[in-house]
């Protein structure tokens, strides 16, 4: 028996269902009584789901897995994983035994989009050109860790005086907080882009500082 899986990782959004595809080619006259199918975590060998002795033995993994019972006889050994969590990420091995056996591993990559960034400015009043301000760009509930990029109003990348921190929340998703310290010009727009590297999703936030006096305050 030869087991086939997709070589590319399966990308699944948090809280959605994912299918880990696995197939084999049954011989003529094949019956499910001959089939031993085991899904397990590749690294720890923890049992996830199994079909043995002619019947579905059910989920051994938080009761969120299922096979496609009507398709097994056709060689479809795929596994359905419901309500995906970040902790589900990793490699899963599909092990098929009929007379002989074969196995193959499929990788599950979990992802969650980042929220539209919120921008805060400190100090946020009595600003003058030449003041040093702190701009914080915060985006929430994403996975995996984000990349953050800053630009000024002309689209020029701002790389100095940036501190980016990732804080995992209760669900293991990430909140990203990026702080830019910049000396104000007369007018200025500052943009942050939060990128999810797996989803190639970009979330944009910007702050425009206007209405300040256009001249620097007189020297004392």
């Amino acid at each position: 028996v030869e087991v086939q899986v997709s070589e590319d990782p399966v990308v699944a959004l948090v809280d959605t269902d994912a299918t880990l595809r696995c197939s084999f080619s049954p011989e003529p006259g094949f019956s499910l009584a001959q089939l031993n199918l085991i899904w397990q975590l590749t690294d720890t060998k923890q049992l996830v789901h199994s079909f043995t002795e002619g019947r579905d033995q059910g989920s051994a993994y938080s009761n969120r897995t299922a096979l496609f019972p009507d398709l097994l006889v056709q060689g479809n050994a795929s596994l359905r994983l419901q309500r995906v969590r970040v902790t589900d990420e990793g490699s899963y091995t599909c092990f098929v035994s009929i007379q002989d056996f074969d196995s193959a591993a499929v990788s599950l990559q979990v992802a969650a989009p980042y929220s539209k960034p919120s921008m805060t400015l400190e100090p946020n009043k009595d600003l003058r050109p030449g003041n040093m301000v702190t701009i914080t760009c915060s985006s929430y509930q994403g996975y995996p860790e984000a990349e953050v990029f800053w630009k000024d109003g002309q689209g020029v990348p701002l790389t100095g005086n940036v501190t980016t921190s990732q804080m995992a929340n209760e669900r293991g998703l990430f909140d990203v907080h990026s702080v830019l310290r910049v000396v104000l010009g007369a007018n200025g727009t500052y943009s942050c882009l939060v990128r999810n590297p797996v989803l190639q999703q970009d979330a944009h936030g910007s702050v425009t500082i206007t209405g300040q006096p256009l001249t620097f305050p007189p020297e004392a």
Epitope: E89, S165, N169, R181
Partner: antibody, heavy 117, light 111 residues
């Protein structure tokens, strides 16, 4: 040189309140997430709170509602307002500068809070 | 909450030998990118000091005799060769999800 100096600890009765301060120097205070971590008399370490900016804070469930973290970026000071204190809150309270993935890179010397009748 | 269990609670190691401290998490603190486990040293009367972050990265200024390894649920701090000044209590801490928690500590004595 990064320097964090806590103050405000002392003896307080159960149900009472206390406000701790942490004066920071030697780094750009406003750029960093700041945290409070405490150490019980049994030497157990517990994360208390973290703050990104004035409106972005994080707490463990056990501290929510009773403890409030805040900061004054103009004066480089971190605060921890504690209320409805219990004997279990007796600990050395440390101010810490958080690293980029929530480790605690720099610690102050701590201020001792004792909750007792 | 993720519970971190350190072992042993205490150990005595001869000068110049290897000290190995284990930290086991009640669930994985790793992703495909990082292991969110950190190690601290605390001497009597002093605050904790960061030694290792993200499982294996040596904090600036920390001697190279300290090293960290591990992923998933099992992590190790190694000190080799042990020096007299390494007598202290060592703590692990994770930052994989809220709340961030610490291990109970391992007290290292130098023989």
């Amino acid at each position: 040189e990064v320097k964090l100096v806590e103050s405000g600890g002392g003896l307080v009765q159960p149900g009472g309140s206390l406000k701790l301060s942490c004066a920071a120097s030697g780094f750009t205070f406003s750029s960093y997430i700041m945290s409070w971590v405490r150490q019980t008399p049994e030497k157990r370490l517990e994360w208390v709170a973290s703050i990104v900016s004035s409106n972005i804070t994080y707490y463990p469930d056990s501290m929510k509602g009773r403890f409030t973290i805040s900061r004054d970026n103009a004066r480089n000071i971190l605060y921890l307002q504690m209320s409805s204190l219990k004997s279990e809150d007796t600990a050395m309270y440390y101010c810490a500068r958080s690293g980029t993935r929530a480790w605690f890179a720099y610690w102050g010397q701590g201020t001792l809070v004792t909750v007792s009748a | 909450d993720i519970v971190l269990t350190q072992s042993p609670a205490s150990l005595a190691v001869s000068l110049g030998q290897r000290a190995t401290i284990s930290c086991r998490a009640s669930k994985s603190v790793s992703t495909s990118a990082y292991s969110y486990m950190h190690w601290y040293q605390q001497k009597p009367g002093q605050p904790p000091k960061l030694l290792i972050y993200l499982a294996s990265n040596l904090e600036s200024g920390v001697p190279a005799r300290f090293s960290g390894s591990g992923s998933g649920t099992d992590f190790t701090l190694n000190i080799h060769p042990v020096e007299e000044e390494d007598a202290a209590t060592y703590y692990c801490q994770h930052s994989r999800e809220l709340p961030y928690t610490f291990g109970g500590g391992t007290k290292l004595e130098i023989k």
